[in-house]
């Protein structure tokens, strides 16, 4: 008879999620020569150890807690890209800014990108069929205290000028709700940051308006004011432009406005 | 601006002691968690330690669980990393830096332990 397993409301682990987080550990330690030394079945089996046999409903910071130990890495702190609802032009960003950092450049945040895992109460199993949706099943789910832990560990280490992209195509630019909003914002130690700089990228190619003066950036900028942290706003019009400068600053074109 | 400066590295024989200082300034040291990182030659950074603001919770890598105490002197602004029964795998240079990781940026040079007879 088959056991009776939980039916969620989210898709289910990512197939062959144990081999990709293996793998992806091999090559970020094989591309980054100073994680040389981190041993991949040790990360694996911490992850692993977060939440196998646990509710996938009653995941903690702390059930994580091994695994961060083993993912201890070097950020300049000075040198942090977060980002909201535009991940692929943020990582498109740092790998060509190559001293910058998304939380996705660290091996922690490249293990788990685009991932989804969870397991079940008292069994070894990974469930393959269906996992905890944040809305309509439980918020205390594997995926979303994974992210909201390193996400939060990841702008408490940030200092001086700490850059953040919007996505200015959204109706919300600066969303509460978003991790950036709900997380991290929340998170930047005012003692060590003096700025968070927006940089709100355009979605049209004819879109002159400065997005900087919506009412959500300016909810963002008191957010922020209130934190004694300063604030300030940059309109990336063209975005194209703006990572072909990042490439070729020489560029005559690129001392126009982007 | 977050400043540190670590001291109290030196040469010591196998099962000797050590006790590892570090100063801080440019920020209010008791709301900060602060941590011990190391290096080792040819090695990449290690986590240590860590202990919460008020000194009240402390934390550590199984590889010197039962060796080393790591405690705050928050009228100081000073942390400290008593290091007992010293093994040459402990052989490093030694970090402090605010918060508790796993992501670091130390703003010190560091102070090196070497273990060897």
């Known amino acids: 008879v088959p056991r009776w397993r939980q039916q969620w409301s989210g898709p289910g682990t990512t197939k062959r999620f144990p081999e990709t987080v293996l793998a992806r550990c091999v090559k970020y330690t094989e591309i980054h020569p100073e994680m040389r030394h981190v041993d991949c079945q040790s990360v694996w089996d911490a992850f692993k150890g977060a939440f196998i046999s646990k509710h996938p409903c009653n995941i903690t910071e702390e059930d994580y807690q091994p695994l961060m130990k083993l993912g201890t890495q070097t950020v300049p702190c000075n040198k942090i890209l977060l980002w909201s609802r535009i991940k692929d032009l943020a990582h498109q960003f740092t790998q060509v800014q190559r001293d910058m950092f998304t939380l996705e450049d660290t091996l922690l945040g490249y293990l788990a990108d685009d991932l989804t895992w969870c397991g079940e109460f008292n069994t070894s199993k990974i469930n393959y069929q269906s996992c905890p949706d944040w809305r309509k099943d439980c918020s205390n789910n594997p995926v979303s205290v994974f992210w909201k832990t390193v996400s939060r560990r990841f702008a408490e280490a940030a200092c001086d000028v700490v850059h953040v992209m919007l996505n200015g195509s959204r109706s919300k630019i600066f969303d509460k709700n978003s991790t950036f909003g709900s997380v991290e914002v929340h998170n930047l130690q005012p003692e060590k940051v003096q700025t968070l700089e927006a940089w709100v990228i355009h979605g049209g190619r004819e879109d002159s308006r400065d997005l900087c003066q919506d009412p959500t950036i300016k909810e963002l900028e008191s957010i922020i004011s209130k934190r004694n942290i300063q604030f300030s706003c940059k309109n990336i019009y063209r975005p194209d432009k703006f990572l072909q400068c990042v490439k070729n600053p020489e560029d005559s074109s690129c001392t126009s406005e982007i | 601006e977050v400043q540190v400066l670590e001291s109290g590295g030196g040469l010591v024989q196998p099962g000797g002691s050590l006790r590892l200082s570090c100063a801080a300034s440019?920020?209010?040291?008791?709301?900060?968690?602060m941590s011990w990182v190391r290096q080792a030659p040819g090695k990449g950074l290690e986590w240590v330690s860590t202990?919460?603001?008020?000194?009240?919770?402390?934390d550590y890598a199984d590889s010197v669980k039962g060796r080393f105490t790591i405690s705050r002197d928050n009228s100081k602004n000073t942390l400290y990393l008593q290091m007992n029964s010293l093994r040459a795998e402990d052989t490093a240079v030694y970090y402090c830096?605010?918060?508790?990781?796993?992501?670091?940026?130390?703003r010190g040079q560091g102070t090196l332990v070497t273990v060897s007879s």
């Open positions: 830096a605010d918060g508790r990781g796993p992501f670091f940026d130390y």
């Open positions: 440019g920020f209010t040291f008791s709301n900060f968690a």
């Open positions: 202990i919460s603001g008020s000194g009240g919770s402390t």
